[in-house]
């Protein structure tokens, strides 16, 4: 029989490396998405980013972000999203609840959804990295 392993203790700089990788990949995704001309950002979509009532890195809404990016992957075949999802999974607890996303059906609206979420994801990873590094600085002072 098997016993559950002890909780995994990851050094904060390992978590930071994951978020740095996500930040870099988010820029790649946004650059790719922005190549589509004539598409405007929409106010109708909001990507959950950081939770104010949790400590880094658990303050990142990774399960919801994953669900939004999975939706983009289904709408537009961006292979970089596969790698993004693999890294997000390093931050997602196995028992995290699922997030349901309502997908736009109109082609142009889909493009607006993709651009908006990609832009918000890039900004979110910048914020996440800032919250991680400032948290690390506070921990050492």
């Amino acid at each position: 029989s098997h016993t559950l392993p002890v909780r995994l203790l990851r050094p904060s700089d390992d978590v930071q490396k994951i978020v740095e990788e996500l930040q870099s990949l988010s820029k790649m995704l946004l650059k790719d998405v922005e190549e589509e001309k004539g598409v405007l950002v929409s106010q109708n979509y909001t990507l959950p980013c950081l939770s104010p009532d949790a400590q880094p890195p658990n303050n990142i809404h990774s399960p919801a972000i994953r669900a939004y990016l999975k939706t983009i992957r289904q709408l537009d075949n961006k292979s970089v999203i596969d790698e993004i999802i693999e890294h997000l999974d390093k931050l997602i607890f196995q028992d995290a609840p699922e997030t349901n996303i309502s997908v736009p059906t109109d082609t142009h609206e889909c493009k607006r959804f993709i651009l908006t979420i990609s832009q918000q994801f890039s900004e979110c990873m910048d914020l996440a990295l800032k919250s991680l590094t400032s948290g690390a600085q506070q921990a050492t002072t």
């Epitope: 390992d14 490396k17 999802i85 997602i92 607890f93 196995q94």
Partner: antibody
């Protein structure tokens, strides 16, 4: 107790396909990646691909792309690995494996199936 | 794809010897590495995950460490039952490649 039970040994002709199953029991979580690995006689372990059973999301080794298809049936907690256009070099033991731990991403494969021997011979 | 270069491919040591096996990753994998033991005709068994955490029930003589992109599995005092082939595998990004394996024998 977590268990992975694979289907029985297969003998196949070159050019045909094989589908190996892997049934999980005693595991309740949905956010995890299961992998498929093979081992040719006297050789090392070779990663073939992985599936996220909750969504059917898959990743494949470049070497097997186009020849391997990994699927999962959530209702029966069973994963499948199908390899087509078989050749003699595909004679190997095929394993499914999956992790235990607190994150969706693996950092080690804790549980392994017993292995399925596939022999490709004319 | 990230390459895992494992060395040596085989080694022979005496009972009680300290044995080290190394895997070098072609890029930084930030501790996302596991070590497995496979005895002849048996299923691989997880020894170490996340570079240095021992799996449940693994004898304390097995340990893992890291220096940059080099990961080491150490058997502090080799026992007859440790005769096996040892593999590393990374999990930083797919494909989750394995090292070529190290066959450990008793002198």
């Amino acid at each position: 107790q977590v268990q992975l039970v694979q289907s029985g040994a297969e003998v196949k002709k070159p050019g045909s396909s094989v589908k190996v199953s892997c049934k999980a029991s005693g595991y309740t979580r949905t956010r995890y990646w299961m992998q498929w690995v093979r081992q040719a006689p006297g050789q090392g372990l070779e990663w073939m691909g992985a599936i996220y059973p909750g969504e059917g999301d898959t990743r494949y080794s470049q070497k097997f792309k186009g020849r391997v298809t990994i699927t999962a049936d959530k209702s029966t907690s069973t994963a499948y690995m199908e390899l087509s256009s078989l050749r003699s070099e595909d004679t190997a033991v095929y394993y499914c494996a999956f992790p235990e731990g607190q994150y969706a991403a693996p950092y080690g494969m804790h549980y392994w199936g017993q292995g399925t021997t596939v022999t490709v011979s004319s | 794809a990230i390459q895992m270069t494992q060395s040596p491919s085989s080694l022979s040591a005496s009972v009680g010897d300290r044995v080290t096996i190394t895997c070098r990753a072609s890029r930084n994998i930030h501790n996302y590495l596991a070590w497995y033991q496979q005895k002849p005709g048996k299923v691989p068994k997880l020894l170490i995950y996340y570079a240095k955490t021992s799996a449940s029930g693994v004898p304390s003589r097995f340990s893992g460490s890291r220096s940059g992109t080099d990961y080491t599995l150490t058997i502090s005092s080799l026992q007859p039952e440790d005769v096996a082939t040892y593999y590393c595998q990374h999990f930083w990004k797919t494909p989750w490649t394995f090292g070529g394996g190290t066959k450990v024998e008793i002198k």
